[in-house]
Interface confidence: medium
Amino acid sequence: LEVSESPGSIQVARGQPAVLPCTFTTSAALINLNVIWMVTPLSNANQPEQVILYQGGQMFDGAPRFHGRVGFTGTMPATNVSIFINNTQLSDTGTYQCLVNNLPDIGGRNIGVTGLTVLVPPSAPHCQIQGSQDIGSDVILLCSSEEGIPRPTYLWEKLDNTLKLPPTATQDQVQGTVTIRNISALSSGLYQCVASNAIGTSTCLLDLQVISPQPRNIG
């Protein structure tokens, strides 16, 4: 018995179905085939869970959170014991093991390992201004999404003809900040933050209005 090498890992967008592959070769009939799929969740590495079980010609449910969402891709018994997970959740991210036993085949490698990462597009980011908007001040434009896997990067643009930030601006695409030093009237305008990752983008807008000093009455 030899379980085939699995692809290292699989990525799927949240809510989409995932197929976790596991196939094996065996010299014995599939009369005594036992298959267990286990997961070590990323969120709780100390607590492996049973996903689905095939034993004695019957299928058995694993952990309650998988009920109704998991099944073998083909009719069992078979040498392809891949499974599907429907409506993938963030909590499904983890390391999955298929364990195969098919007596009397002694077996070489009887475990297949596949990583599953459930990807989440960035949620609508929150845009805000930090600091005084008085002319000559320094301001920081902040942008962050509550959700997003992999972690989103943030790109700020000024919505004018050039889409360029003012020359005094410095941008941190990881933190989602733009620092604009010594703001002037030219700094005023609409700014857009684009949060993006491997599977999606999301935006927010911010209106920066630089306040000019009030002319003092002389009299």
Partner: antibody, heavy 120, light 107 residues
Amino acid sequence: QVQLVQSGAEVKKPGSSVKVSCKASGGTFSSYAISWVRQAPGQGLEWMGGIIPIFGTANYAQKFQGRVTITADKSTSTAYMELSSLRSEDTAVYYCARARGSTWGYFDYWGQGTLVTVSS
Amino acid sequence: EIVLTQSPASLSLSPGERVTLSCRASQSVSNYLAWYQQKPGQAPRLLIYDASNRATGIPARFSGSGSGTDFTLTISSLEPEDFAVYYCQQRDNWPLTFGGGTKVEIK
């Protein structure tokens, strides 16, 4: 580091039974085959049978079929080997051994051994 | 069952010498053969698996070769701690079987 700790030495009468335990620590217990191998004084190694705890089904050498029972308790990460109808030639050191990687057949971790003496 | 015959049964050598141990199977076991070392009062220790792969932590002086029915364990230069009994074992078929062992003694 995986460790297999076996129960202590036993002296038994012919015709009786002995049950030896093997407690695993430091690794995943359920997924790996645990086998029992015995060694009579001054003799070689003899495989008796084994079990993959997560499946619960054991596999035995024909020679011991009907006389040996191998079980595993996943909750305590402990495997057991019970040998019945003991005779003097069952006097041996009994080892539990964990399969290398995920295979049934090679043993990379061994218990310290349990001496079972069968004597009237 | 598959019978494994080891030869010689014992041999006396000095540290630094090269040693070659043989294991012959009664029928082909492909490359599904392992070698173990056992010292008095200790459990066996896995040296080689699948005929030629060194187990974790095993020094490079130990090497295995062969396939089918004829296998060899070679120790390129004996160290004092290498004097022990060596067993071969097959996993090609049930039951798993071991050879009778070769005792390597200090001359």
